[in-house]
């Protein structure tokens, strides 16, 4: 139905706008839900019908048609969100899309030139969708107002139809590679944002804590809580509508995923206004910026080993709780920076802006997870540093992608457990840990490139330097070594699951009085330090002023032994 | 204790199959993968391929492939290898060992193929 | 396949006596792990990866090496120590062990 429609074009992508910009006709037929005006610059045309529109992210047209018994009605015209097939047509060729009432059929197009969505240049006759057949008449928008209101009577019943629709597939939700063609939308994803979006009065924005390539992340309060609060400009309206479908899926709620409070619009001023994801703040910061600053010993390394392997098992997880439905999730850019401390010391895993629902074996009949496009749809995605060689050399395996996305997660998650437990003095007994580095910071530096990533990684099959000291603390001597070769072995189908990292976390968690320890360990093992050695102070709120004009109160890092470097920033979300 | 403990002696005539058996205890089985090594007498150790409970995922060493399977029953921790179209060189002691680098093996299987 | 070549195939010596055992793989290897084994008796694993020493293992035996050249060294062989020797290689598939190295009494 309308839900299949491709209503893609609802969902901007923020990328370049392209050199020499694509013009099209822009019009959208009143009662129309969403729009696409956000995806180009409305050009003046006066009072004049049909509008033009200057294309901000493709180069690409499109348009709607309602063809029914007696004439072909134009529903929406406008800017593609991205160069994708049928863009390259010259001319506008409708292909039949869903029927919303009897005796009805919508027809949509692509094409890539001016003004080509203006007019189609054939439809079947209505009796039968799909074959060519003599042009019918088109109808120019704002022709008379008989025509207005035969489109408004008409849009009144699609609306009803289409409320129906959206009802039943509730559950019927797809989510999308950020910045990757949408092939079936969420039913709601095409609403206008700055409609459907309540503002919040009592949200307020205090200090930016990290700023990304799509949000900006600030530490704010909700109703006397601190909150993080990711602010989406509205060029980036499609990665909002991605994530926040990911926080809206029922029983995503776990001690180990950031929590989802709510989405809302606004900013820290009136120029700043967009779509906001209103986010659980974690004041200790990322995971990253935690390891630079602080050393843990074997029990709170081994709380953020676990608590990362428990989320990320949670997430990879398919299975059905309180009569809801779950999906897998692979989570596709796991890293020390979207990683975040909570107040007890263990991990939740953040920025799900990402992720991808995965194929399941137990999912409802209503449910349809999207089927990425393409190799470059489920590849292309992550930080480069954590990204495992499968991803680098693009060698994944296509024909099991949900399993094979899992394992590069895995991938990443040995990467984090290395960098957890290169700051652990307990697996140092012969000396403090050196300051803290990024995976294969030591061997490539601060910002790696592709290329240097996959000689290393893949080439040279290289790894993070394990410490021989590392055998010392454990109830296995090698049990740390092993369960990270396990992890970031070269071969994805032999690393372990989540569910198992878990399990050998848990084995490793008490060293047992019983097991002497090696003699090639040097000088034993040193006592644990106390639970409270890495304490960090609660952040101090000041009062909070209301959304427009910035709040102020600090979220304290704690004395900061060394400034995090450049590939490590603060980040909550 | 770790233990992996296998199933006893077999006879097989040429171009039958056989299906050893691996019991694990002591340990999540689940949590680590579980090779299967031979050694024909007087010869040296050979790998043959793995299966690893917590996915059921396996790979065989290209030389078996086709006529090996290893396959898990998890509820019982235990581990099979079936090798069919049996062969006289396939006489060998068939041993089961866990993944963390063959840390702990199975007490071996003799298996005779005999006509 | 790597193939591991070990040498000698067999070796005599004493109690008391530093013996070497080593292995050359046909092409570079990151890691390998030895392995002792007796007759009628599964492997026992010695050093994993290279030259750390499984838990429990004597520390007259020492694994070094790198690329495509590794030794075991036992410093003072001991009575317990008569045995055939193999290394093993992961580094690839198929996972390859050399042919062995038989440690007989001199």
């Known amino acids: 139905m309308l839900g299949s429609l491709g209503l893609w074009a609802l969902l901007p992508t923020a990328v370049e706008a392209p050199p020499n910009r694509r013009t099209c006709v822009f019009f959208e037929a009143p009662g129309v839900r969403g729009s696409t005006k956000t995806l180009g610059e409305l050009l003046d045309t006066g009072t004049e019908l049909p509008r033009a529109i200057r294309c901000l992210y493709s180069r690409c047209c499109f348009g709607i048609w309602n063809l029914t018994q007696d004439r072909a009605q134009v529903e929406m015209q406008g800017c593609r969100d991205s160069d994708e097939p049928g863009c390259e047509s010259l001319h506008c060729d409708p292909s039949p899309r869903a029927h919303p009432s009897p005796g009805s059929t919508l027809f949509t197009c692509s094409c890539g030139t001016d003004f080509c969505n203006a007019n189609y240049s054939h439809l079947p006759p209505p009796g039968s969708p799909g074959t060519p057949g003599s042009q019918g008449p088109q109808a120019a928008p704002g022709e008379s107002i008989w025509m207005a209101l035969v489109l408004l009577g008409l849009f009144l019943l699609l609306l009803l139809l289409l409320g129906s629709i959206i009802l039943a597939l509730l559950q019927r939700k797809n989510y999308r590679v950020r910045g990757e063609p949408v092939p079936e939308p969420r039913p709601d994803s095409g609403r206008d944002w700055s409609v459907e979006l309540q503002e919040l009065p009592e949200l307020c924005f205090s200090q930016v804590i990290r700023e990304g390539g799509h949000a900006v992340v600030w530490a704010g309060q909700l109703q006397g809580k601190l909150v993080a609060i990711k602010a989406f400009p509205p060029r980036s309206v499609a990665q909002f509508q991605a994530e926040r479908a990911l926080y809206e899926l029922p029983g995503l709620q776990h001690d180990h995923i950031v929590r989802f409070i709510t989405a809302s619009r606004g900013g820290p001023g009136r120029l700043l206004s967009g779509p906001l994801l209103v986010l659980e703040l974690h004041p200790k910061g990322s995971l990253c910026h935690y390891l630079t600053q602080y050393t843990s010993d074997w029990g709170s390394s081994l709380r953020m080993a676990l608590s990362l392997a428990q989320g990320l098992a949670f997430l990879h997880e398919e299975r059905w709780q309180n009569g809801q439905y779950k999906p897998g999730i692979a989570h596709r850019d796991l890293s020390s920076q979207n990683v975040l401390i909570r107040e007890d010391g263990s991990c939740a895993i953040g920025d799900l802006g990402l992720a991808l629902v995965l194929p399941g074996l137990t999912q409802p009949p209503a449910w349809t997870p999207t089927q990425p496009q393409g190799p470059a749809a489920i590849m292309e995605a992550g930080t480069q540093r954590y990204m495992a060689p499968e991803l680098l050399d693009k060698t994944l395996d296509l024909q099991d992608w949900g399993m094979a996305l899992r394992r590069a997660d895995i991938y990443s998650l040995a990467l984090l457990l290395w960098e957890i437990l290169s700051r652990c003095p307990d697996l140092r007994p012969d000396s403090s840990p050196p300051p803290f580095q990024l995976a294969y910071e030591a061997e490539l530096g601060n910002t790696p490139t592709s290329d240097e990533l996959w000689a290393l990684a893949v080439q040279e099959r290289r790894r993070p330097y394990i410490p021989s000291t590392w055998r010392c603390f454990a109830t296995d001597p090698d049990g740390l070594r092993e369960l990270l070769e396990d992890c970031w072995d070269a071969d994805p189908e032999a690393r372990l699951t989540a569910e198992c990292v878990q399990q050998r976390l848990a084995a490793l968690a008490h060293p047992q009085e019983s097991h002497p320890f090696p003699e090639s360990c040097p000088r034993g093992c040193p006592p644990l330090c106390p639970e409270d050695c890495t304490s960090i102070p609660a952040p101090t709120i000041l009062p909070c002023r209301p959304q427009r004009s910035a709040c102020h109160f600090s979220v304290q890092q704690g004395p900061c032994s060394r400034n995090p470097q450049p590939a490590c920033t603060l980040s909550p979300v | 204790q770790v233990r992996l403990v296998q199933s006893g002696a077999e006879v097989k005539k040429p171009g039958a199959s056989v299906k050893v058996s691996c019991k694990a205890s002591g340990y999540t089985f689940t949590s680590y993968h579980i090779h299967w090594v031979r050694q024909a007498p007087g010869q040296r150790l050979e790998w043959m391929g793995w299966i690893y409970p917590g996915d059921d995922s396996t790979k065989y060493s290209q030389k078996f492939q086709g006529r090996v399977t290893i396959t898990r029953d998890t509820s019982a921790s235990t581990a099979y290898m079936e090798l069919s179209s049996l062969r006289s060189e396939d006489t060998a002691v068939y041993y089961c060992?866990?993944?963390?680098?063959?840390?702990?093996w199975g007490q071996g299987t003799l298996v005779t193929v005999s006509s | 396949d790597i193939q591991m070549t070990q040498s000698p195939s067999t070796l005599s010596a004493s109690v008391g006596d530093r013996v070497t055992i080593t292995c050359r793989a046909s092409s570079s290897v990151r890691y390998i792990a030895w392995y002792q084994q007796k007759p009628g008796k599964a492997p026992k694993l010695l050093t994993y990866p290279t030259s750390s020493l499984k838990s429990g293992v004597p520390s007259r035996f020492s694994g070094s090496g790198s690329g495509t050249e590794f030794t075991l060294t036992i410093s003072s062989l001991q009575p317990d120590d008569f045995a055939t020797y193999y290394c093993?290689?992961?580094?690839?598939?198929?996972?390859?062990f050399g042919g062995g190295t038989k440690v007989e009494i001199k």
């Open positions: 093993l290689q992961w580094s690839s598939y198929p996972w390859t």
């Open positions: 060992t866990r993944g963390d680098r063959f840390a702990y």
